[in-house]
């Protein structure tokens, strides 16, 4: 931000009424009125260029310093080219000297050169040849000097002429302030610029109304430089929840809008399924029947629990059931749907029912399922099962009602045995099998059916109570089709798949395990 200038003295603006002191009196500097660019102007002039040594002083009135520490002196002046005078005016100069003196009181007309300290020799960048103001050929020079630190109540400036032809059109003395500033939603007060060039005054800012320093953020600070410019901003303020930045202020969110936290973002429109918010809202309340999960951002629409899964089917395969369903027709507006499967079994004889989670096996954990199918195995034969599939989302926990669908299935058969070839020879095959332990108690015997591959007319049957059998009197180097089926009191269980096992050829000897 540009420095603010506080003017202490302005000769040009005073209309020739300042009455500065000249020394020697009546000689040297003169107050002149002239016309420049069709405007009357006042100036102090001196032009004793043909008269030998000159020592003409012009002293300002006493200037009250006030709060200034460093003053800036801006001079606008013109100097006539010495060579444009008759004979080059041999004693002519093209510079003058600028002095100052500090004092606690006004000395009036008591002028003492010795009290003055030289600031600088002032030289023009351009000299004027034609010196007629009305002809508009005057070359105006602008020079600025600064002095500080000042400590007394006031000061004088003085101009010493040593034989130049000079017109002083403007003398402006001012000090600089860093202006009152709003930046980063922080207010920085008007601050007097320091007097030492390397130093920067640190100034603390205060957050504007309804703005706060963000958590973990730095308090707003700026530095006021000597030239009255603010530099090096540190930290910032942000509009608090319910307010947004409008130019350099925080304005309450309009009705129907909200802002959840202190941030740089603007107020957002209330999302779907929310009630119209009042002015300055930090969030928007959900419509009846809609909810917001704890982890949901305030910008997210309010949602509700899903409807029940769609089209639940249960397909029995022996002692297994495959459950399939389609997602709910109404997701509740969320994508975080998961499914939970529960199981209930009922004994047909007694009609008694109970949970069956402990006795069945799921192809994956039955709670928090994201897929829409699961296989349940280790079911007991001749048992009625009811499966419940519940759909849940992030807000289901906020309501007591549940969204589920059920499917029932009766298991009439045992699960097909899993068959393995344990060993073989040229004339025998050793076969074993297994079924889930919960079903083993219901099995009375196992029936092994086998026949030569390609011979569909004849087959052999062996029954056993155990889990293995050796089939003898087989032909060498021949493939046999083998199937095992459990027999229960209620009838036959599910048969295993048909396996192809081959006896060894006569060249291969011994009973080799496969």
């Amino acid at each position: 931000a540009q420095g603010k200038e506080v003017v202490l003295l302005d000769f040009a603006a005073a209309g020739g009424e300042l009455g500065w002191l000249t020394h020697p009196y009546g000689k040297g500097w003169d107050l002149m009125q002239n016309i420049m660019n069709d405007m009357p102007i006042y100036m102090y002039s001196v032009c004793n260029v043909m008269s030998g040594d000159q020592d003409n002083w012009l002293r300002t009135n006493w200037v009250y310093r006030g709060e200034a520490e460093r003053i800036f002196i801006e001079l606008k002046f013109t100097v006539r080219d010495c060579n444009s005078f008759p004979g080059g005016a041999s004693s002519c100069k093209e510079t003058f000297n600028l002095y100052y003196a500090e004092s606690d009181l006004d000395y009036g007309t008591n002028f003492q050169k010795r009290l003055f300290t030289k600031i600088d020799t002032i030289a023009p960048d351009e000299i004027t040849v034609s010196s007629d103001f009305e002809a508009r050929h005057v070359k105006l020079n602008v020079e600025e000097r600064s002095v500080g630190p000042l400590t007394r109540k006031g000061f004088y400036l003085a101009f010493q002429d040593i034989g130049a032809c000079v017109a002083l059109l403007s003398v402006r003395v001012y000090y600089k302030k860093c202006p009152e500033l709003l930046q980063g939603l922080a207010h920085f007060p008007e601050t007097i610029a320091g007097s030492d060039a390397p130093s920067l005054a640190t100034v603390a800012g205060t957050c504007v109304d309804h703005a706060v320093v963000p958590p973990g953020g730095e308090e707003p600070r700026m530095h006021c430089a000597v030239d009255g410019e603010w530099l090096v901003p540190i930290g910032q303020c942000l509009c608090q929840a319910g307010y947004e930045k409008v130019e350099d202020a925080c304005q309450a969110c309009s009705p129907g809008f909200f802002k959840f936290e202190a941030s740089e973002s603007p107020c957002l429109e209330c999302p779907e399924h929310t009630l119209p918010s009042p002015e300055g809202a930090t969030s928007c309340e959900c419509e009846e029947g809609f909810f917001r999960a704890p982890q949901d951002p305030a910008s997210m629409p309010c949602t509700r629990p899903p409807s029940a899964p769609h089209y639940l089917t249960a397909v029995g395969m022996g002692a297994k059931v495959e459950l399939r369903w389609t997602p709910p027709q109404d997701s509740g507006g969320r994508e975080d749907i998961v499914y939970s499967v529960t199981c209930e079994q009922c004994w047909p004889e007694s009609g008694e029912c109970g949970p069956c989670e402990a006795s069945v096996r799921y192809s994956e954990p039955p709670h928090g399922l994201t897929r829409t199918s699961v296989t349940v195995s280790d079911l007991e034969p001749h048992m009625n099962y009811t499966f419940t599939v519940e759909a849940r989302n992030g807000v289901s926990g906020l309501v007591t009602s549940r969204s589920f669908r059920t499917a029932s299935v009766s298991i009439n058969q045992t699960e097909p045995p899993k068959v393995r070839l344990e060993g073989r020879s040229t004339t025998s095959l050793s076969v074993s099998w297994s079924i889930p332990p919960p079903q083993q108690s219901r099995v009375w015997k196992y029936e092994v059916t086998y026949r030569k591959k390609g011979d569909s007319n004849s087959y052999n049957v062996r029954r056993t109570e155990g889990f293995s059998v050796t089939l003898d009197d087989l032909a060498p180097d021949t493939t046999y089709l083998v199937q095992v089926q459990a027999l229960t009191q209620e009838g036959q269980g599910a048969g295993s798949k048909v396996h192809e096992f081959q006896t060894l050829s006569p060249e291969g000897s011994g009973n080799l395990a496969v």
Epitope: M32, M43, S45, C47, S51, S84, F85, P86, E134, A135
Partner: antibody, heavy 118, light 111 residues
């Protein structure tokens, strides 16, 4: 009191040269420029040139360049003007003049009458 | 060169009356508010004597009957009232530019 004392009248022949002197007193000789002015026919005043006694630097009216030569002798506080190749047109009263405080011809010598005649 | 034109060339005024002499410059002789115009009085057999410096300032020792005015290119010397001792030739002169030049003179006589 500032005083400028010029040499006496001269009668010279055409084509000759002559030198007029002007002795200064009552001020610092080297502090002020010395001018020379000619007055012809008892009326017209013309500036011839000036010399800075401090450094001997001089400046001439173009009309008199080659006609007048200005010199000084600081030790005697005297300024000189030599007039060259005189003609009857150069007959006039010649004044030495010191600048005043404000660019005026403030202090005049009494004048030297030069008559050029065969 | 700046040409200074004086008028009238001669002037006869009754004792006690006002005499006004004009001097017109071919270009401005002003610098920074100062008019580099000077007025001289010359009596026969004497060198010119400075009356007015910088157009309007009375030289020390000159009677207040003499006054000067004007700026830029038009200047006036006024003698009021005229006395017998004022019979002389009056010259204007400029020092604003090189070379300094003089007006042609105005001869003042008593009616």
């Amino acid at each position: 009191e500032v005083q400028l004392q010029q040499s006496g009248p001269e009668l010279v022949k055409p084509g000759a040269s002559m030198k007029i002197s002007c002795r200064a007193s009552g001020y610092s000789f080297t502090g002020y420029t010395m001018n020379w002015v000619r007055q012809s026919h008892g009326k017209n005043l013309e500036w011839i040139g000036l010399i800075n006694p401090h450094n001997g630097g001089s400046s001439y009216n173009l009309k008199f360049k080659g006609k007048a030569t200005l010199t000084v002798d600081k030790s005697s506080s005297t300024a000189y003007m030599e007039l060259l190749s005189l003609t009857s047109e150069d007959s006039a009263v010649y004044y030495c003049v010191r600048w005043g405080d404000y660019g005026s011809f403030a202090y005049w010598g009494q004048g030297t009458l030069v008559t050029v005649s065969a | 060169d700046i040409v200074l034109t004086q008028s009238p060339a001669s002037l006869a005024v009754s004792l006690g009356q006002r005499a006004t002499i004009s001097c017109r410059a071919s270009e401005s002789v002003d610098t920074f508010g100062y008019s580099f115009i000077y007025w001289y009085q010359q009596k026969p057999g004497q060198p010119p004597r400075l009356l007015i410096y910088r157009a309007s300032n009375l030289e020390s020792g000159i009677p207040a009957r003499f006054s000067g005015s004007g700026s830029r290119t038009d200047f006036t010397l006024t003698i009021n009232p005229v006395e017998a001792d004022d019979v002389a030739t009056y010259y204007c002169q400029q020092s604003n530019e090189d070379p300094p030049t003089f007006g042609g003179g105005t001869k003042l006589e008593i009616k």
